[in-house]
Interface confidence: medium
């Protein structure tokens, strides 16, 4: 490559080998060849000889000028025409790059997906820089003032094992390249508040043989501590609208929820929970489908090995009400 050229002279770039895209650029070549008084000095960009805007400054030096250089990367080299030599003689080469200083990273968010063991932070890097840009995530404990740094691209996974300095942190990103440096706004995170809980699981359903058939859904929330608020939504697969049942209790064991459903119908159930005082809901559990019997006989459903792909309509829930819309949300 260009970087390994053994130069017989010098090549330099003004304003520099890395510069802002759209700038005017001059590339200089100065020969220091033995036994050669060059007739001409030639410039090549990405292997193609330049024909225009070349100026011979003196016996040993020439310049090529580019107006509004807009290529992210280019390989430049220059050669000399030596009298009596059939081939041009290589003088020197340089890789040049153009781009932009980084934007201040924006829209930073950090979450802990339950049981992942990581705090995952993402951000918007802004417009492309076209040049090598490093992102450093700074994490400062507000309880101990300890600060840690992590090198990243456009996201970072930080082991929760390393977050030993308490619950509250300031997190920000610094973007740096050869053309500039920008910091994001500082994000204050409370680890309790950014946990995205794992979904609950509906394990089975059964409809009992009775005068009024009753369907029991067996399910378990993975939220194990404190009080939990849960919602179970269900609907016939032929319906657009979800019905929602709400639960508010202390769950550490398998729950049983009872429903009185139409016979000979296919229903889909989903459940989600939220720890009391916690910001984030679990995602809706995988859809669980149960077929009610035609007549009074017992039917049991178990979850399939493969998740069932069922298009469902989400519900906007108010206590005691249900309305449907046309977006998909199957958890």
């Amino acid at each position: 490559g260009i970087a390994t050229i053994n130069c017989s002279g010098n090549m330099w770039v003004e304003p520099g080998e890395i510069f802002q895209m759209g700038m005017n650029v001059s590339v200089y070549c100065q020969e220091a060849l033995k036994n050669c008084r060059p007739r001409n000095l030639h410039f090549y960009k990405n292997g193609f000889k330049e024909r225009f805007h070349i100026t011979r400054i003196n016996r040993t030096t020439a310049r090529v000028w580019y107006k509004g250089f807009s290529e992210p990367h280019a390989s430049m080299y220059c050669t000399a025409e030596c009298p009596g030599r059939f081939q041009e003689t290589l003088i020197c080469g340089k890789d040049i790059s153009s781009g932009y200083p980084p934007d201040a990273p924006s829209n930073m968010t950090c979450v802990i997906y339950e049981y992942s063991g990581n705090m995952t932070c993402t951000w918007n890097t802004g417009k492309p820089t076209y040049i090598d840009t490093k992102y450093t995530v700074h994490v400062k404990s507000l309880e101990t003032e300890e600060q840690q740094q992590y090198l990243a691209s456009n996201y970072v996974n930080i082991s929760t094992d390393s977050l030993q300095g308490g619950r509250k942190y300031l997190v920000w990103v610094q973007a740096v390249n050869a053309l500039g440096m920008e910091n994001s706004q500082q994000l204050q995170v409370h680890l309790d508040d950014i946990v995205i809980p794992s979904p609950s699981i509906i394990s089975r359903a059964e409809t009992t043989n009775a005068n009024v058939p009753k369907t029991i859904i067996y399910w378990k929330s993975k939220i194990m501590t404190g009080k939990v608020f849960c919602e179970m939504r269900y609907k016939a697969t032929t319906n657009q609208t979800w019905n929602v049942k709400e639960f508010d209790t202390n769950y550490t064991y398998v729950q049983q929820s009872e429903f009185y459903l139409e016979p000979n119908s296919k229903y889909v159930f989903q459940v989600r929970c939220q720890g009391t005082g916690k910001r984030n809901w679990q995602p809706w559990s995988s859809p669980f489908v149960h077929q009610t019997p035609q007549t009074a006989s017992q039917v049991t459903s178990k979850p399939p090995h493969e998740p069932q792909k069922i298009e469902m309509l989400t519900a906007t829930i108010f206590k005691g009400h249900s309305t449907s819309d046309n977006s998909q949300d199957i958890g």
Epitope: Q148, D161, Q164, G166, L191, D192, V195, G275
Partner: antibody, heavy 122, light 106 residues
Framework: QIQLVQSGPELKKPGETVKISCKAS????????MSWVKQAPGKGLKWMGW????????TYADDFKGRFAFSLETSASTAYLQINNLKNEDTATYYC???????????????WGQGTLVTVSS | QIVLTQSPAIMSASPGEKVTMTCSAS?????MYWYQQKPGSSPRLLIY???NLASGVPVRFSGSGSGTSYSLTISRMEAEDAATYYC?????????FGGGTKLEIK
């Protein structure tokens, strides 16, 4: 079960150095920070600072900057407290203590070593 | 730094009696933690996050409070509860303990 076992009592002269160990067992050592707490005879508890066992970075409370040093031997699941240039007022029981996690964050000191009595006397 | 002031410094109670001790913070804190220490022993965690009982702690212990005022209550004093009790905060660096309340049995 989780245990923090500290080294035995020490009798030192002023100006000497002491190094106390705290060996952890029953959990992954690098998952929880280790704090050190001082208790002078007949007095209350004073938090000295802590060391992040994942990164090895120590943090010292203001009163314990200078002569005090926290360190780790991760392969041995052991944390150390070293006190240099001992003074009479360093006479105390020193505890290592590990925070627990409630949910996904570090909480209170749920686990304590048995304490190491350091006596400084000429 | 946040100073935690415990009161009373020393108190005594008869078996079966209700006991309340307080911890006052010089600035508002988010959570309070309580420890029990008996002579010759290491401290033991009683209450975390202001009101949650640590593992193995009898239900006669309870914690409450918010802002700058917190309390620890023993609903019915037992002989084994004679000890020194410390409050502690994590909300602001450096972490600090209160001076302790020594609870004696009558």
């Amino acid at each position: 079960q989780i245990q923090l076992v500290q080294s035995g009592p020490e009798l030192k002269k002023p100006g000497e150095t002491v190094k106390i160990s705290c060996k952890a067992s029953g959990y992954t050592f690098t998952t929880y920070g280790m704090s050190w707490v001082k208790q002078a005879p007949g007095k209350g508890l004073k938090w000295m600072g802590w060391i992040n066992t994942y990164s090895g970075v120590p943090t010292y409370a203001d009163d314990f900057k200078g002569r005090f040093a926290f360190s780790l031997e991760t392969s041995a699941s052991t944390a150390y407290l070293q006190i240099n240039n001992l003074k009479n007022e360093d006479t105390a029981t020193y505890y290592c203590a590990r925070r627990d996690r409630y949910g996904y964050v570090a909480g209170a000191f749920a686990y304590w070593g048995q304490g190491t009595l350091v006596t400084v006397s000429s | 730094q946040i100073v935690l002031t415990q009161s009373p410094a020393i108190m005594s109670a008869s078996p079966g009696e209700k006991v309340t001790m307080t911890c006052s913070a010089s600035s508002s804190v988010s959570y309070m933690y309580w420890y029990q220490q008996k002579p010759g022993s290491s401290p033991r965690l009683l209450i975390y996050d202001t009101s949650n009982l640590a593992s193995g702690v009898p239900v006669r212990f309870s914690g409450s409070g918010s802002g700058t005022s917190y309390s620890l209550t023993i609903s019915r004093m037992e002989a084994e509860d004679a000890a020194t009790y410390y409050c502690q905060q994590w909300s602001s660096y450096p972490w600090t303990f209160g001076g302790g309340t020594k609870l004696e049995i009558k």
